[in-house]
Interface confidence: low
């Protein structure tokens, strides 16, 4: 039975050219996390595997950095980065948990939400 819940940074916004941290946290379960996948729509951004550590997709390696923790840092943001991001936790014995984050990249300095996750 899957008892865990995924907490995420929710809907966040950031300025074009800036950086943002996408963060998910799995709680309320003792299941072992074996791998976390980060995806944007159907594109794989990165994985953090318990045995292998981090792997960043080659097409994002210049703009994506692992961490902090199991989170993901997006840099040099463009308006095209606006959209849904998913953290997919593979766990044993529970199975798969998925969290959703919506990122809006703004042209001007009107980013208000998610400031505590933003990198100066």
């Amino acid at each position: 039975m899957m008892t865990g819940t995924i907490e995420t940074t929710g809907n966040i916004s950031a300025e074009k050219g800036g950086s943002i941290i996408l963060q998910c946290h799995l709680s309320s379960t003792t299941a072992q996390v074996t791998q976390v996948n980060w995806e944007q729509q159907d594109q794989l951004l990165a994985i953090c595997n318990a045995d292998l550590g981090w792997h960043i997709s080659p097409s994002f390696k210049d703009r994506v950095a692992p961490g902090p923790g199991l989170g993901l840092t997006l840099q040099s943001l463009t308006v095209n980065d606006t959209g849904e991001y998913f953290c997919i936790y593979h766990t044993y014995p529970d199975g798969t948990y998925t969290g959703r984050i919506f990122l809006e990249v703004l042209e001007s300095s009107v980013a208000e939400h998610g400031a505590r996750f933003q990198i100066p």
Epitope: Q35, L44, I47, A50, D51, H55, G95
Partner: nanobody, 115 residues
Framework: EVQLVESGGGLVQPGGSLRLSCAAS????????MGWFRQAPGKEREWVAS???????WYADSVKGRFTISADNSKNTAYLQMNSLKPEDTAVYYC?????????WGQGTLVTVSS
């Protein structure tokens, strides 16, 4: 039940080639990470290469440029093409996947590089 069955190992001379296969069953292959590890006699098991859905691949520095990992989702099979083999590549090669369990290992296939 997840099952991984490796094949293709054998004895090969230095500079030769081998192609290892890993037939997988019991999970949705194209949603999973697949990889190869190896264990040489008296040494710890070490990661060799991995392939993710979408075809993304990574290699250990020791095999980069010589080994190629690939996956055929329609056949539920992963491959490791090994070229320019060296004596230090001698090991038991294991196929592994991560499908939400700690790890699933095949029985391994022995590769011996010797003249």
């Amino acid at each position: 039940e997840v099952q991984l069955v490796e094949s293709g190992g054998g004895l090969v001379q230095p500079g030769g080639s081998l192609r290892l296969s890993c037939a997988a069953s019991g999970f949705t292959f194209d949603r999973s990470w697949m990889g190869w590890f190896r264990q040489a006699p008296g040494k710890e098991r070490e990661w060799v290469a991995s392939v993710l859905r979408g075809g993304y691949t990574w290699y250990a520095d020791s095999v980069k440029g010589r080994f190629t990992i690939s996956a055929d989702n329609s056949k539920n099979t992963a491959y490791l093409q090994m070229n320019s083999l060296k004596p230090e590549d001698t090991a038991v090669y294991y196929c592994v996947t991560d499908v939400g369990a700690p790890d699933y290992w095949g029985q391994g296939t022995l590769v011996t590089v010797s003249s």
